[in-house]
Interface confidence: medium
């Protein structure tokens, strides 16, 4: 799915209102420096691509995130604020229902959610941009001068 046409500000508002708190709840008891952030993203559509992948795609050692509260709210936000996103996820949802039978919090899952927190942080706060400046690195940001 191409996240270029999503309403980034509405997704950000959803994150600040609820998703961030659910991520913190999931990570409660874990030190903020326990995991190194190895996943990064360059611009907002890229961040959402990485967020979707880490949240919904099963990985070795962590196959249960999709049923977590933060994942369900992430899915809802993307469905509401990304045109056509829901349609692309129907088959994926069926696969997830078959693959995930229980919620198990493993160290690998904690590490993955730590990566997610970093991706969300980057999505929410791309650096401030000067209108008409040559500092732009991300094509999507050229059309979004107000990042909040």
């Amino acid at each position: 799915y191409d996240f270029t046409n999503c309403d980034f500000e509405k997704i950000k508002a959803a994150y600040l209102s609820t998703i961030s708190k659910d991520l913190i709840t999931y990570m409660s008891g874990t030190k903020s420096t326990e995991f190194n952030n190895t996943v990064s993203c360059s611009n907002r559509p890229h961040c959402l691509t990485e967020i979707q992948s880490l949240t919904f795609n099963p990985t070795a050692g962590c196959a249960s995130l999709a049923k977590e509260m933060f994942a369900m709210k992430t899915k809802a936000a993307l469905a509401i604020w990304c045109p056509g996103y829901s349609e692309t996820q129907i088959n994926a949802t069926q696969a997830m229902k078959k693959a995930r039978k229980s919620k198990v919090t493993t160290n690998k899952c904690l590490e993955q959610v730590s990566q997610l927190q970093g991706l969300w942080r980057r999505f929410n706060r791309p650096l401030l941009k000067q209108q008409g400046s040559s500092d732009y690195k991300d094509d999507d940001d050229k059309h979004h001068h107000h990042h909040h």
Epitope: Y15, S32, N37, R121, F123, R125
Partner: antibody, heavy 120, light 111 residues
Framework: EAQLVQSGAEVKKPGSSVKVSCKAS????????MHWVRQAPGQGLEWIGA????????SYNQKFKDRATLTVDKSTSTAYMELSSLRSEDTAVYYC?????????????WGQGTTVTVSS | DIVLTQSPATLSLSPGERATLSCRAS??????????MHWYQQKPGQPPRLLLY???NLGSGIPARFSGSGSGTDFTLTISSLEPEDFAVYYC?????????FGQGTKLEIK
């Protein structure tokens, strides 16, 4: 505990440059925007610019764009702010600050400040 | 640039009194229903300390006597009952639009 420790006070001549360092600890340095703010004696706060250590991307206040250079050394979790062509009005306390954990856009961790005095 | 105008410049009150500080933006700092206005407290020789974020949310470890309100262009910081340690300079800050800007500050002094 997240902490920022800045380099010591500097006295510089007009026209010269100064480079202030800010060493981070207690958090994953590469995933937080790092900002620089200055405060002239008896004055308010003025934003200089910011850098994202993850890829070195920078953003500057236009007022400082030609004179300020922000860099990072990820291996030592240190941010740097260099200001060139110094003039007397650059005399100020320079702070580094970490942008918050969630993307709200506030500064939740500050360095102790570095006093830069520009005098002939 | 968004200009933040704080008033009054100086506020003289006694411990136990209620303090009301204002910050007015030259244009709205709201986006998607959220107000991106933050407040800091600064004491002499110290860096600023976050008091409130997004207009009304208390920063970590900040006493409940501090509260904030407002949206769009008009924001208020209220200290319900002043303690001796509250006498300091207070700054508002917006990050909705580049460049990030601060207000000029309100000095809260003991009467």
């Amino acid at each position: 505990e997240a902490q920022l420790v800045q380099s010591g006070a500097e006295v510089k001549k007009p026209g010269s440059s100064v480079k202030v360092s800010c060493k981070a600890s207690g958090f994953t340095f590469s995933t937080y925007n790092m900002h620089w703010v200055r405060q002239a004696p008896g004055q308010g706060l003025e934003w200089i610019g910011a850098i994202y250590p993850g890829n070195g991307e920078t953003s500057y206040n236009q007022k400082f764009k030609d004179r300020a250079t922000l860099t990072v050394d990820k291996s030592t979790s240190t941010a740097y702010m260099e200001l060139s062509s110094l003039r007397s009005e650059d005399t100020a306390v320079y702070y580094c600050a970490r942008e918050d954990d969630y993307g709200e856009g506030y500064f939740d961790v500050w360095g102790q400040g570095t006093t830069v005095t520009v005098s002939s | 640039d968004i200009v933040l105008t704080q008033s009054p410049a100086t506020l003289s009150l006694s411990p136990g009194e209620r303090a009301t500080l204002s910050c007015r933006a030259s244009e709205s700092v709201d986006n998607s229903g959220l107000s991106f206005m933050h407040w800091y407290q600064q004491k002499p020789g110290q860096p600023p300390r976050l008091l409130l974020y997004r207009a009304s949310n208390l920063g970590s470890g900040i006493p409940a006597r501090f509260s904030g309100s407002g949206s769009g262009t008009d924001f208020t910081l209220t200290i319900s009952s002043l303690e001796p340690e509250d006498f300091a300079v207070y700054y508002c800050q917006q990050i909705n639009t580049d460049p990030l800007t601060f207000g000029q500050g309100t000095k809260l002094e003991i009467k």
